[in-house]
Interface confidence: low
C-alpha cells in the first residue's frame, strides 16, 4: 500500500484546512492508527491528534477543540483531519504516521500554507495645487502573507515608489504615487490595486484627484460695440473663468458704485435699458481658496444724439 496526501495545502486565514492522509491499501489491509504531528525543521515533533481504529480521536491539549475528523461516513483507511480556523502560527510542516496491519508503518509529510489576505488602505497626500512640483498624490499600504503586490491603475502621468517592511510572519508593502499637479488631472481616478493569492480578485481603492487651480478671467459681452447704445435692453456682461474649488464672482465699478438697476447674478452683470450713466470701468473679481483673478472692461454707451464714436478698451489683470 501507499499513502496519498498533498504536498501543499493552502488555506486563507480563518478557514478550515483539510490535512489529507489516505492509505491506499490492498484488499484486507487495515489501518490501526494515524498519528498527526507538527514536523517543522529545528523543532521537536508536536502531536496534533491520534486517530485510532478502536479508541477514536484523541486531540493534543495544544489543539483541543481545533482538530476534528471529517464528518461521516468515514472510510476506515482515511486518516485525514480538519484543522479548524487556521491561523498564521499553523503554517508549517505536518506529518501523518499510519500504522497498518499487516503491511506495517507509513509516513507522509505536507506543508500547510496559511494565506493572510491584506486589508489595504489608501492615504491621500497633501492638497494638490497647480504650479507645485512633484507632489505625493497618495500612498497605499497593504500587509499580508505572503507579501502583497501593490500597483496603481490610472490615466494620470506620475511616478511610483515602493518599499516593503518584513515582519515575522507577514510583510507590509507601501507604494507612493507622485505627480506634477495640473488642472487636467482634476477629477481623474487614481486606483490602488492590491494583488494577493489569498484574494479571489484584486482589491481596488480609488481616490479621485482634486487639483486646486484658477483660470485667467475674461469678460464677454462687449464683442459688438454697436449694441451698446442708449435705450438698448438686455445688455449684460459675463465673467468667464473656471477653477477648483469652483470660484465665486464679484462685480464692482472702478470709477464709482454700480449704477442703480444693474443686477449682479453670480458671474453675470445685467443692465437695465442703457443710458450714458452706465458708461464706466467694470471689474470682475474671481476667487477661490486657491487664488484670485481680476478682469476689467470699459463700457462706453453710445448716445445716437452725439456724433462722437464709442471706444471700448479691455484690460485683464491678475
Amino acid at each position: 500500500g501507499e499513502l496519498e496526501t498533498s504536498d501543499v495545502v493552502t488555506v486563507v486565514l480563518g478557514q478550515d484546512a483539510k490535512l489529507p492522509c489516505f492509505y491506499r491499501g490492498d484488499s484486507g489491509e487495515q489501518v490501526g492508527q494515524v498519528a498527526w504531528a507538527r514536523a517543522d525543521a529545528g523543532e521537536g515533533a508536536q502531536e496534533l491528534a491520534l486517530l485510532h481504529s478502536k479508541y477514536g480521536l484523541h486531540v493534543s491539549p495544544a489543539y483541543e477543540g481545533r482538530v476534528e475528523q471529517p464528518p461521516p461516513p468515514r472510510n476506515p483507511l482515511d486518516g485525514s483531519v480538519l484543522l479548524r480556523n487556521a491561523v498564521q502560527a499553523d503554517e508549517g510542516e505536518y506529518e501523518c504516521r499510519v500504522s497498518t496491519f499487516p503491511a506495517g508503518s507509513f509516513q507522509a509529510r505536507l506543508r500547510l500554507r496559511v494565506l493572510v489576505p491584506p486589508l489595504p488602505s489608501l492615504n491621500p497626500g497633501p492638497a494638490l495645487e497647480e504650479g507645485q512640483g512633484l507632489t505625493l498624490a497618495a500612498s497605499c499600504t497593504a500587509e499580508g502573507s505572503p507579501a502583497p503586490s501593490v500597483t496603481w491603475d490610472t490615466e494620470v502621468k506620475g511616478t511610483t515608489s515602493s518599499r516593503s517592511f518584513k515582519h515575522s510572519r507577514s510583510a507590509a508593502v507601501t507604494s507612493e504615487f507622485h505627480l506634477v499637479p495640473s488642472r487636467s488631472m482634476n477629477g481623474q481616478p487614481l486606483t490602488c490595486v492590491v494583488s494577493h493569492p489569498g484574494l479571489l480578485q484584486d482589491q481596488r481603492i480609488t481616490h479621485i484627484l482634486h487639483v486646486s487651480f484658477l483660470a485667467e478671467a475674461s469678460v464677454r459681452g462687449l464683442e459688438d460695440q454697436n449694441l451698446w447704445h442708449v435705450g438698448r435692453e438686455g445688455a449684460m456682461l459675463k465673467c468667464l473663468s473656471e477653477g477648483q474649488p469652483p470660484p465665486s464672482y464679484n462685480w464692482t465699478r472702478l470709477d464709482g458704485p454700480l449704477p442703480s438697476g444693474v443686477r449682479v447674478d453670480g458671474d453675470t452683470l445685467g443692465f437695465p435699458p442703457l443710458t450714458t450713466e452706465h458708461s464706466g470701468i467694470y471689474v470682475c473679481h474671481v476667487s477661490n481658496e486657491f487664488s484670485s483673478r481680476d478682469s476689467q472692461v470699459t463700457v462706453d454707451v453710445l448716445d445716437p444724439q452725439e456724433d462722437s464714436g464709442k471706444q471700448v478698451d479691455l484690460v485683464s489683470a491678475s
Epitope: E4, T5, S6, V9, T10, D16, A17, K18, L19, P20, F22, P70, P71, P72, S80
Partner: antibody, heavy 123, light 107 residues
C-alpha cells in the same frame, strides 16, 4: 476564454455503447479536475463521474460504476466518457464541467460547464 | 451519500420580489456548497460558491448564507432574467450531490 464543448451524443439501443468527448480550451487543462454531470429530460442534475487533473484518480456514481469509464488526454485537452451497457435510464443530456483541486479529494464547485450533448437510449 | 434537500420545489413570484430558497444537507458539509442557475435548454451557471461567495460576473442581488447543514440562496429583487431553476450542490465529499431543484416562475 474558457470553453468546454461536448460531442458524441446520439441515439443508441439498450446494451449499446457510446463514447462522449469534451474538448477544453482557454485554460490549463491538466490543472483541473473534470466531471461529467447528466440531466434526464425534465429532471434534476446528477453527478456521474470525475477525474483528477493528472488522471490518476477517478470517481463514479454507484449507478454507473462498472459500466462507464472516465479518462482524459491532457496532450489533447480532451475529456472522455466511455459508456457501455447503456440503459434507458441513462437517457439524458450529459455535461462536462471543470473544478479546481483545493486539497487532496476536496474540489471547488464547477465554475464552467459545456453546453451538453444528448444521449438517448431507446430501442 | 450526502442528501441535499431543497425547498420549495417551486415558487411563483413577481419582478421586484425578495426570493429565498433553502437547502439542507443530511450531514455537515462546512461551506462546501454551491448554488447554480439553469434556464431551459442551457447549461447550469455557477452563482454562489463556498456557501456565500458570489461568483465573478454574477449580479449582487444574489447572495448565499449558511454553513454546516443549512443554507440559503436569496435574490433580493427578482429580475425578469432570474426566472429559472436553481440547484444547490455539495462538493464536500464524493459523490457530490445536488438538491432536486427549485423552479422560480412568474406569478
Amino acid at each position: 476564454e474558457v470553453q468546454l464543448v461536448e460531442s458524441g451524443g446520439g441515439l443508441v439501443q439498450p446494451g449499446g455503447s457510446l463514447r462522449l468527448s469534451c474538448a477544453a480550451s482557454g485554460f490549463t487543462f491538466s490543472s483541473y479536475a473534470m466531471s461529467w454531470v447528466r440531466q434526464a429530460p425534465g429532471k434534476g442534475l446528477e453527478w456521474v463521474s470525475a477525474i483528477s487533473g493528472s488522471g490518476g484518480s477517478t470517481y463514479y456514481a454507484d449507478s454507473v460504476k462498472g459500466r462507464f469509464t472516465i479518462s482524459r488526454d491532457n496532450s489533447k485537452n480532451t475529456l472522455y466518457l466511455q459508456m457501455n451497457s447503456l440503459r434507458a435510464e441513462d437517457t439524458a443530456v450529459y455535461y462536462c464541467a471543470r473544478a479546481e483541486l483545493l486539497a487532496f479529494d476536496v474540489y471547488t464547485a464547477s465554475d464552467y460547464w459545456g453546453q451538453g450533448t444528448l444521449v438517448t437510449v431507446s430501442s | 451519500d450526502i442528501q441535499m434537500t431543497q425547498s420549495p420545489s417551486s415558487l411563483s413570484a413577481s419582478v421586484g420580489d425578495r426570493v429565498t430558497i433553502t437547502c439542507r444537507a443530511s450531514q455537515g458539509i462546512s461551506s462546501y456548497l454551491a448554488w447554480y442557475q439553469q434556464k431551459p435548454g442551457k447549461a447550469p451557471k455557477l452563482l454562489i460558491y463556498a456557501a456565500s461567495s458570489l461568483q465573478s460576473g454574477v449580479p449582487s442581488r444574489f447572495s448565499g448564507s449558511g454553513s454546516g447543514t443549512d443554507f440559503t440562496l436569496t435574490i433580493s429583487s427578482l429580475q425578469p432574467e432570474d426566472f429559472a431553476t436553481y440547484y444547490c450542490q455539495q462538493h464536500y465529499t464524493t459523490p457530490p450531490t445536488f438538491g432536486q431543484g427549485t423552479k422560480v416562475e412568474i406569478k
